[in-house]
């Protein structure tokens, strides 16, 4: 470090360290003056600052601090946006899988069905994304919705395919009759369990990490009081009008400035750490019907099993169906 | 049991070592995730010595500045002269979070609220009684696990293999037929929850 | 540990050229705005050129303005000072400075000073 400067009788050296912040010298005085206007940088005797100074001196202060704390927050900001992306889009992937999956199994196992399975699978696991992405739609309503679209194509094709499919007058009995006969036994319900609590825990998740984002960029924009300015610049720039071009703050006098700039943001504190424990008995809770990629790539095989249900029991159900369904499907007949 | 093409199937006995260990699943990039964001948990409690620590401080120098004038590093008027006859260090902190800090503040209140009432204990057993009708769930050991029921195979464990990461620019065909998969074959009344999720390639 | 080496000092006649190097390292160069400074003989420091890190933005005291030129390579770790036109008051120990996050506050780091005289 260079030797210590003798007394300046002018303000030189002052000027051209201003200069660094501010280009042109009108601000600076050209020797030292009382500065019985300063409201920050006190003098003791004469001083090289202006009240302008100050003025910049407190401006550069603040926009330091906003600087320092996004630099401080990069790290973070950088792992939460880039997991909140890749989760959101692998959760997409699985459904699209899983979508997929119960499509190749009906092309496979129920030819007859495709077309019309296919547009209900679609829908389904649609409504599925959607839920994920925060949309307020029912999970026990898109489980219903699939099998009670589902029950009238299965009835008309695979249980009785001589039946014309035409009018809509049997299909809605037809969807009446799949909740009140329990048609497929409890496949509906099971799934509704499974869907919900794997659906609820990953939205909440993927809510969680844009909430993390939020936190992080709240704080990373927030705007330092005036207060927080002048301590800042009593730390930082008031040595300069004394002349004193090399010394730095004391390391505790920093700790204190901060301590009081931050006493706001430090509050969060609380809530961060328990925000992070939280998440962390969360996921640590994601595994079996709590994992949405375990539950919705295994739908596939719950509804074949849920088909067959219906196949095994077609006998009395047809027959139940008849008598039920029956004024429906007179009018069809005629 | 669905059908599936004869390429895609594969013998219940190879499904043993038909996953790589070291795959990525969505499950431990979770976990993954939450080890790195503990390293943050102190974040903002440790702000302003990260702060001090980024912005120049008298480290090796003899002398340093408190706010008034040039003091001795290790003096007691290291840290307090600068703050005297200044406004009150006391005051700025009474004054409260700012509006927007609070605001997040609620936010994480809330949500911290949303995820413990969603927080399972771990190695709960999957509900039972989910039906009247005496449907249950298996459970099978370990975390990552999950349980296929063969009709009278017993418990064939399986590694949950959706290799999300190198799958994030993959899309699969709907001629795809589930790979790797054995079905589940629910007994009369029964029915095996998990299935395996297949080598998706 | 971060250290700065000035080198290129020395006696020039009036009007005459220097280039004055830096050579830094213990930190990442590229990313650090740097400054020189100087200190005439019995007299107190004077700023005299800044330069971001990227060398994209560069500033100067008025009375080196047209006359010296900040510069750096960052894949050398090296700023430079190259200083046209001398006079007699340009003679000083000029040091390199690491800027620190706070822009215009007190630099982090200094180098030992290399030493320039301008005489006839």
């Known amino acids: 470090q260079p030797p210590p400067p003798p007394p300046d009788a002018t303000c030189h050296q002052v000027r051209s360290f201003f200069q660094r912040l501010q280009p042109g010298l009108k601000w600076v005085p050209e020797t030292p003056v009382p500065g019985s206007d300063l409201q920050v940088c006190l003098p003791k005797g004469p001083t090289c600052c202006s009240r302008k100074m100050e003025e910049k001196y407190q401006l550069t202060a603040r926009l330091n601090m906003e600087q320092l704390l996004q630099s401080a927050s990069m790290e973070l900001k950088f792992l939460i946006i880039q997991n909140a992306a890749v989760f959101q889009e692998a959760f997409e992937i699985v459904v699209r899988h899983a979508k997929n999956y119960t499509n190749a199994m009906f092309k496979n196992n129920y030819p007859s069905l495709t077309p019309q399975a296919f547009e209900f699978v679609g829908e389904f696991f649609t409504d599925v994304s959607l839920y994920i992405l925060g949309s307020d739609i029912n999970v026990d309503d898109m489980v219903n919705e699939l099998f009670d679209s589902l029950f009238p194509v299965i009835y008309t094709q695979l249980m009785n395919p001589g039946l014309p499919d035409s009018a809509l007058d049997i299909n809605e009995c037809l969807r009446g009759a799949r909740r009140d006969l329990k048609v497929f036994g409890n496949f509906p319900k099971l799934i509704m369990t499974q869907v919900s609590k794997s659906l609820q825990v990953t939205r909440i998740f993927l809510q969680a990490l844009n909430l993390g984002i939020e936190v992080i960029n709240t704080t990373d924009h927030l705007k330092f009081s005036k207060d927080c300015g002048r301590m800042l610049t009593r730390m930082w720039y008031c040595s300069y009008c004394q002349g004193l071009m090399m010394v730095k703050p004391c390391g505790g006098y920093c700790n204190v400035v901060m301590q009081g700039c931050m006493a706001g943001v430090v509050e969060i504190d609380k809530y961060w750490r328990e925000y992070i424990l939280s998440l962390e008995e969360l996921v640590n809770g994601m595994y079996r019907i709590y994992d949405m990629e375990n539950v919705l790539l295994g739908l596939f095989s719950t509804i074949h099993d849920s088909i067959q249900y219906v196949q095994k029991n077609a006998g009395k159900l047809t027959t139940t169906i008849g008598k039920l369904c029956a004024h429906s499907q007179q009018r069809q007949y005629r | 049991s669905a059908y599936y093409p004869e390429d895609l199937f594969i013998d219940k006995k190879v499904l043993k070592v038909a996953h790589v260990e070291h795959e990525e699943t969505l499950s431990s990039r979770r976990r993954e995730l939450i080890q790195k964001l503990k390293s943050f948990i102190s974040f903002y409690s440790a702000l302003p010595g990260y702060i001090c620590s980024h912005s120049p401080v008298a480290e090796n120098d003899t002398l340093c500045w408190n706010g008034q004038e040039l003091v001795e590093r290790y003096s007691q008027k290291a840290a307090r002269n600068g703050m005297k006859n200044q406004f009150n260090l006391h005051e700025l902190k009474m004054k409260g979070p700012e509006p927007v800090v609070s605001q997040i503040i609620d936010k994480l209140k809330h949500i911290n609220q949303l995820l413990r009432t969603m927080s399972m204990p771990k190695g709960r057993v999957l509900d039972k009684n989910l039906d009247e009708e005496g449907f249950e769930s298996g459970d099978c050991g370990d975390d990552e696990d999950e349980c296929i029921g063969g009709s009278g195979d017993g418990m064939i464990k399986v590694k949950n293999q959706l290799r999300f990461l190198a799958e994030l620019a993959y899309d699969l065909d709907v001629d795809d037929a589930p790979g790797n998969s054995q079905q589940a074959t629910p007994k009369d009344n029964e029915i095996s929850t998990f299935h395996n999720l297949g080598n998706v390639h | 540990e971060v250290q700065l080496v000035e080198s290129g000092g020395g006696l020039v006649q009036p009007g005459g050229s220097l280039r004055l190097s830096c050579a830094a390292s213990g930190f990442t160069f590229s990313s650090s705005a740097m400054s020189w400074v100087r200190q005439a003989p019995g007299k107190g420091l004077e700023w005299v050129s800044a330069?971001?890190?990227?060398?994209?933005?560069?500033n100067y005291v008025d009375s080196v303005k047209g006359r010296f030129t900040v510069s750096r390579d960052n894949s050398k770790n090296t700023l430079y000072l190259q200083m046209n036109r001398l006079r007699a008051e340009d003679t000083a120990v000029y040091y390199c400075a690491k800027e620190s996050m706070v822009r215009g506050g007190p630099f982090d780091y200094w180098g030992q000073g290399t030493t320039v005289t301008v005489s006839s």
């Open positions: 330069i971001s890190g990227s060398g994209g933005s560069t």
